[in-house]
């Protein structure tokens, strides 16, 4: 529907509170370095303007697009050139090029200080003193660090954040109540950000067709009783929502997501039997709940897929008449029968099927040519099954920390050019697949593991894209979205890599390591491990284990010493010498 004033339309649909929150998120995701106060000022100005448009849609500038209004507002920031450099050049462009320009300058790894959590009493005081500012600051800090965070979902996180403080700041033991809740929100938030980043990468790097294929597979697994036409409608609507959010159109995105949740709940009888509880919740909880809802039960007596997609004489006719619709039906039918497969595996099978039809439908005897297409699926299914089995066995044998270390070594040898912080971050996350997925029964392991790995490898891809250093990473990241994980799995040790010069400073540690949390201490040790492999890529597992064991013993010993700093200085030199000898450096 065409509205006289888009800004008035969205303000009325979303309400003032959500409107302001979403504009703040949008601005913080674009101008990630701007101070909080500057953003609040811009948001207030936009809000006041929106209110004038609500009062009179014909008022001056009310007919302008949201991109024009928001872009104009962002371009009023005085320090744009000094703070953002060439991003300021975006302001010389006209819409829609200006918005595209802002999008291209979003930084997945902004140079921002780590968020340090204040004392609980300090946080509770700040919350009570000015609840609105406290919650806005939360939105701002998350949005600027995660420029692709799914905005309507961030509103849900903020609601939970507020609820945590409301409850816990009145509790007898505030810290015991609040800290686990904040930890949970932080971990869920990071996971949510990474999942959304993959959706945006899918849309932006591989196009709408790739995203729609992903959505068909996932929704068909989740709603196996829904008809293909219903799934197709949901896919179209979901694609619109994510295209908008990934494109910075956060008001439209949130509005359309609410409409989609409403539609799903109004039509749950023809979608899924699992939606009842979700649909009784308020809007933000409802949308979140629907997005996370468990797979419905598969319909009984689903016929063989082969009948329509292999045995039928009409395969090539159906394919030629509407290729994407036919492949979509194949994907829908396969996915609804296989909640035990990862989405990426289902997409690989669909791609194999498509390639076979492209070849066979041009052959002299098409049926003879494609008759054995399902046999080609077997190795594609077995590859992730075997990989998950092996890695879960390794995880159960080693535990999470040592499993992460095994992956650190493995990935550093594959792509040693990648920066150490990125290798540590990505390998630690890859390692979390163990505790996240290996506990599941066989039928749930693959969708859990491989789809999670897709999310983590996308982190590597977006970080690497900012500063490309490895052709192998670029190749695996850009050739095929669904084959990224098999591509990385297939990489062997990079024989072309020239080992890094030894630098004793990299292996010099101080007493401050003793006061770090267990997690931070692990990261320090894992950073050292990556550096070791970069210096000695041919080092054996046994050699690396010996050095790491010595290092752990060294840290433990010096942290117990009376004069910690002296211990770290003297014992550290010995450790470096011993390690050099052990590794032949």
């Amino acid at each position: 529907d065409a509205h006289k004033s888009e800004v008035a339309h969205r303000f009325k649909d979303l309400g003032e509170e959500n409107f302001k929150a979403l504009v703040l998120i949008a601005f913080a995701q674009y101008l990630q370095q701007c101070p909080f106060e500057d953003h609040v000022k811009l948001v207030n100005e936009v809000t006041e303007f929106a209110k004038t448009c609500v009062a009179d849609e014909s008022a001056e500038n009310c007919d302008k697009s949201l991109h024009t209004l928001f872009g104009d507002k962002l371009c009023t920031v005085a320090t744009l050139r000094e703070t953002y450099g060439e991003m300021a050049d975006c302001c010389a462009k006209q819409e829609p090029e200006r918005n595209e320009c802002f999008l291209q300058h979003k930084d997945d790894n902004p140079n921002l200080p780590r968020l340090v959590r204040p004392e609980v009493d300090v946080m509770c005081t700040a919350f009570h003193d000015n609840e609105e500012t406290f919650l806005k600051k939360y939105l701002y800090e998350i949005a600027r660090r995660h420029p692709y965070f799914y905005a309507p979902e961030l509103l849900f996180f903020a609601k939970r954040y507020k609820a945590a403080f409301t409850e816990c700041c009145q509790a007898a033991d505030k810290a015991a109540c609040l800290l686990p809740k904040l930890d949970e929100l932080r971990d869920e938030g990071k996971a949510s950000s990474a999942k959304q980043r993959l959706k945006c990468a899918s849309l932006q790097k591989f196009g709408e067709r790739a995203f729609k294929a992903w959505a068909v597979a996932r929704l068909s697994q989740r709603f196996p009783k829904a008809e293909f036409a219903e799934v197709s409608k949901l896919v179209t609507d979901l694609t619109k929502v994510h295209t908008e959010c990934c494109h910075g159109d956060l008001l439209e995105c949130a509005d359309d997501r609410a409409d989609l949740a409403k539609y799903i709940c109004e039509n749950q009888d023809s979608i899924s039997s699992k939606l009842k509880e979700c649909c009784e919740k308020p809007l933000l909880e409802k949308s979140h709940c629907i997005a996370e809802v468990e797979n419905d039960e598969m319909p009984a007596d689903l016929p063989s897929l082969a009948a329509d997609f292999v045995e039928s004489k009409d395969v090539c006719k159906n394919y030629a008449e509407a290729k994407d619709v036919f492949l979509g039906m194949f994907l829908y039918e396969y996915a609804r029968r296989h909640p035990d497969y990862s989405v990426v595996l289902l997409l690989r099978l669909a791609k194999t099927y498509e390639t076979t039809l492209e070849k066979c439908c041009a052959a002299a005897d098409p049926h003879e040519c494609y008759a054995k297409v399902f046999d080609e699926f077997k190795p594609l299914v077995e590859e992730p099954q075997n990989l998950i089995k092996q890695n879960c066995e390794l995880f159960e044998q080693l535990g999470e920390y040592k499993f992460q270390n095994a992956l650190l070594v493995r990935y550093t040898k594959k792509v040693p050019q990648v920066s150490t912080p990125t290798l540590v971050e990505v390998s630690r996350n890859l390692g979390k697949v163990g505790s996240k997925c290996c506990k599941h029964p066989e039928a749930k392991r693959m969708p859990c593991a491989e789809d999670y790995l897709s999310v983590v490898l996308n982190q590597l891809c977006v970080l690497h894209e900012k500063t490309p250093v490895s052709d192998r990473v670029t190749k695996c990241c850009t050739e095929s979205l669904v084959n990224r994980r098999p591509c990385f799995s297939a990489l062997e040790v990079d024989e072309t890599y020239v080992p890094k010069e030894f630098n004793a400073e990299t292996f010099t540690f101080h007493a401050d390591i003793c006061t770090l949390s267990e997690k931070e201490r692990q990261i320090k040790k894992q950073t050292a491990l990556v550096e070791l492999v970069k210096h000695k890529p041919k080092a054996t597992k046994e050699q690396l284990k010996a050095v790491m064991d010595d290092f752990a013993a060294f840290v433990e010993k010096c942290c117990k010493a009376d004069d910690k700093e002296t211990c770290f200085a003297e014992e550290g030199k010995k450790l470096v010498a011993a390690s050099q000898a052990a590794l032949g450096l």
């Epitope: 007596d301 689903l302 016929p303 329509d308 045995e311 039928s312 004489k313």
Partner: antibody, heavy 121, light 110 residues
Framework: EVQLVESGGGLVQPGGSLRLSCAAS????????MGWVRQAPGKGLEYIGI???????YYASWAKGRFTISRDNSKNTLYLQMNSLRAEDTATYFC???????????????WGQGTLVTVSS | IQMTQSPSSLSASVGDRVTITCRSS????????LSWYQQKPGQPPKLLIY???DLASGVPSRFSGSGSGTDFTLTISSLQPEDFATYYC???????????FGGGTKLTVL
């Protein structure tokens, strides 16, 4: 007992619409391709179309656009929606189960008794 | 696509060997997607033969089918009283939209 029972036939005016039903019992309707065939009084058999196990529909060229085959798996029922009916559509309409699942082989091995549709003003 | 049956009517006696032919205007799918039906007044058709020569379940062995491509034959080796009926051929072609029935052969008592 494995059987097909058609219903919904009757007298309809030219230009009118009618929906025929075919209730299956003793087997799952979605396990085979299901078709509709008609027979005008004193005439031969005429193929209308089929719906495959996966829901693909195929129609004789004369039926395309006016006739629609669908099914409701939960009710184990097959349907034939007929629009813009003409006098020449007067016939007994049979639903039938094809030997194949994904296409029409022309080999229908289970038939209903048929339902008579009369198009007349 | 046309399916032409001949003869359109035929009179014979119990014990006779009877042959009905069916010709299609183009080759049936896989050269063998041809079926034969028997229909008695007031009843639905009954499948006799599928894939040109395979006998449907419960059909007596006196019925047989042969042929390939465009020319097919139904043979009743020794006519029984219950065999007097109308017989139809049906062909499946490269598209499921093109399935077609022959015009029928009415078999009556001589």
């Amino acid at each position: 007992e494995v059987q097909l029972v058609e219903s919904g036939g009757g007298l309809v005016q030219p230009g009118g619409s009618l929906r025929l039903s075919c209730a299956a019992s003793g087997f799952s309707l979605s396990s085979n391709a299901m078709g509709w065939v008609r027979q005008a009084p004193g005439k031969g058999l005429e193929y209308i179309g089929i719906i495959s196990v996966g829901g693909f529909t195929y129609y004789a060229s004369w039926a395309k656009g006016r006739f629609t085959i669908s099914r409701d798996n939960s009710k184990n029922t097959l349907y034939l929606q007929m629009n813009s009916l003409r006098a020449e559509d007067t016939a007994t309409y049979f639903c039938a189960r094809d030997r194949h699942g994904g296409d029409s082989s022309g080999a229908f091995y289970l038939w209903g008794q048929g339902t008579l549709v009369t198009v007349s003003s | 696509i046309q399916m032409t049956q001949s003869p359109s009517s035929l009179s014979a006696s119990v014990g006779d060997r009877v042959t009905i032919t069916c010709r299609s205007s183009e080759s049936v799918y896989s050269n063998n997607q041809l079926s034969w039906y028997q229909q008695k007044p007031g009843q639905p058709p009954k499948l006799l033969i599928y894939d040109a020569s395979d006998l449907a379940s419960g059909v007596p062995s006196r019925f047989s089918g042969s042929g390939s491509g465009t020319d097919f034959t139904l043979t009743i080796s020794s006519l029984q009283p219950e065999d007097f009926a109308t017989y139809y051929c049906a062909g499946g072609f490269s598209s499921s939209s093109d399935t077609a029935f022959g015009g029928g052969t009415k078999l009556t008592v001589l």
